[in-house]
């Protein structure tokens, strides 16, 4: 018992470790991170009149406050609440586009179909898209050397928690018919472990969302299979249906033609299937 007490007394907490920088498995904070976030905020508020009231310095302060001086494996959704509050935005009903493992096409689509919105078309998603960031416990420094990797280090890191937080909010506020773009080239077209599968699906509100329509994007030109019959799509269909939300699925056999037809719906070739 006395020996145990000695060992207990010698336990060292992570925050008591000497002041060398922790080495994480992931890449460090994106260079010029504060400047990038601030510049993106200014640009966004200039282009979106409904967000002109947003004070970008306050946005940066709230963003910074979520992770600076905090142990980067102990970040919570609560840490991001001041930022979420400042970035509150609504999407009109029937205009939400979710995506999973097919970000580029989803963004190309909303660039053409300007009245539909992905998370990255909203202020907070736009600010953080493709960026990495983390701080260190008890210092005001940003760690540009390394940040925690979701798999190898911890899931409660600043980037993962940010996307979980804003994705949850984005799904919670969706209404009407919600669309989701899924990658038909992947082995798991619907992946329960993706942000869409683990966060967004479970936060769509049955009182506000009448239906989820999945667009399964085919990869190969000769791929004529009905991927809406894929077992993972059936799994998604069941999960959504049991949330009392109707589920529809469409194959997008030709994504190039699909985009072309969004740009030019009157094109005669667009009357046939895509």
């Amino acid at each position: 018992s006395g020996l145990n007490d000695i060992f207990e007394a010698q336990k060292i907490e992570w925050h008591e470790l000497p002041r060398w920088r922790q080495q994480w498995s992931g890449s460090g904070t994106t260079s010029r991170f504060p400047e990038t976030v601030l510049a993106r905020c200014v640009k966004y508020t200039e282009v979106h009149p409904e967000m002109r009231h947003v004070d970008c310095q306050s946005v940066w302060d709230a963003f910074k406050g979520a992770f600076i001086s905090k142990y980067p494996c102990n970040i919570t959704e609560e840490d991001y609440q001041p930022l979420v509050k400042l970035g509150t935005q609504t999407v009109p009903c029937n205009k939400t586009l979710l995506w999973s493992r097919i970000k580029d096409l989803a963004h190309q689509f909303t660039q053409v179909q300007r009245d539909m919105f992905t998370l990255e078309d909203m202020l907070l998603g736009y600010l953080a898209d493709d960026l990495t960031w983390c701080g260190e416990f008890n210092t005001f420094e940003i760690n540009y050397q390394s940040c925690p990797d979701w798999r190898k280090d911890c899931s409660n890191n600043p980037v993962s928690v940010f996307w979980k937080t804003v994705s949850r909010r984005f799904a919670e506020t969706a209404c009407g018919v919600v669309h989701v773009m899924l990658n038909g080239s992947r082995s798991k077209i619907f992946d329960k472990n993706s942000t869409f599968g683990s966060v967004e699906v479970h936060n769509l509100q049955p009182e506000k969302v009448q239906a989820l329509e999945a667009w399964v994007i085919h990869g190969g030109r000769e791929d004529s299979r009905d991927l809406c019959q894929d077992p993972t799509i059936k799994e998604l269909e069941s999960i959504i249906s049991k949330r009392n939300i109707r589920f529809f699925c469409k194959n997008i056999y030709r994504p190039d033609k699909f985009l072309q037809c969004v740009k030019n719906p009157e094109d005669s070739s667009c009357l046939s299937g895509i």
């Epitope: 049955p206 249906s241 049991k242 939300i245 109707r246 589920f247």
Partner: antibody, heavy 116, light 111 residues
């Protein structure tokens, strides 16, 4: 908007029987449809559901005994080999105008009697 | 398979009184809230009252209310009227559709 079941009749045990659910005022193909039955003087029993896509799910006790299918305008319930225990009023219920497993719209029911 | 137990049955109530019907599930329903309540009168099909445990269906009087989550649910009828005499059923939806089931029903007698 309404739904109605048809096809109920007196059959001998083992004679396959198909019941049909038809909608008025809306298209059944865009909605989830559930089949429920009620033996005389007894409670309700959930048989199964057909999704918009045609995916079907059944209560454990109903698997292999019942098949739900759909066409553009109707949803069918096939009783493969009826026994006397299948004597009941059969209801189809549609999740119209919204919902899936929630059943706001019921038909009046159709009576199936299985007797030798 | 899941078992939904409704208590009590039958239940007697005076006009203007309150009736509480309980529905207990042997396992948790989907999302802890996928349970609905139906009213059935003799010779008629069931009528939806409450869905997702507590949401009042369109056209249903506000004296009907639902509560509960997971495995324990309650249907409350306040200011009972003679027209409320009927049998009430709960319907649970589960992760495995094979388990989906109605409760045994609770008959409400209005005096």
């Amino acid at each position: 908007q309404s739904v109605e079941e048809s096809g109920g009749r007196l059959v001998t045990p083992g004679t396959p029987l198909t019941l049909t659910c038809t909608a008025s005022g809306f298209s059944l193909s865009r909605y989830y449809v559930t089949w429920v039955r009620q033996a005389p003087g007894k409670g309700l029993e959930w048989i199964g559901i057909i999704y918009i896509s045609g995916t079907t799910y059944y209560a454990t006790w109903a698997k292999g005994r019942f098949t739900i299918s759909k066409s553009a305008t109707t949803v069918d319930l096939r009783i493969a080999s009826p026994t006397t225990e299948d004597t009941a009023t059969y209801f189809c219920a549609a999740a119209w105008p919204v919902g899936t497993y929630v059943l706001p719209l019921w038909g009046p029911g159709t009576l199936v009697t299985v007797s030798s | 398979a899941a078992v939904l137990t409704q208590t009590p049955s039958p239940v007697s109530a005076a006009v203007g009184g309150t009736v509480t019907i309980k529905c207990q599930s042997s396992q948790s329903v989907v999302n802890a809230n996928n349970l609905s309540w139906y009213q059935q009168k003799p010779g008629q099909p069931p009528k939806l009252l409450i869905y997702l445990a507590s949401t009042l269906a369109s056209g249903v009087p506000s004296r009907f209310s639902g509560s509960g989550s997971g495995t324990q649910f309650t249907l409350t009828i306040s200011s009972v009227q003679s027209d409320d005499a009927a049998t009430y059923y709960c319907l649970g939806v589960y992760d495995d559709d094979g388990d989906n089931a109605f409760g045994g029903g609770t008959e409400v007698v209005v005096k």
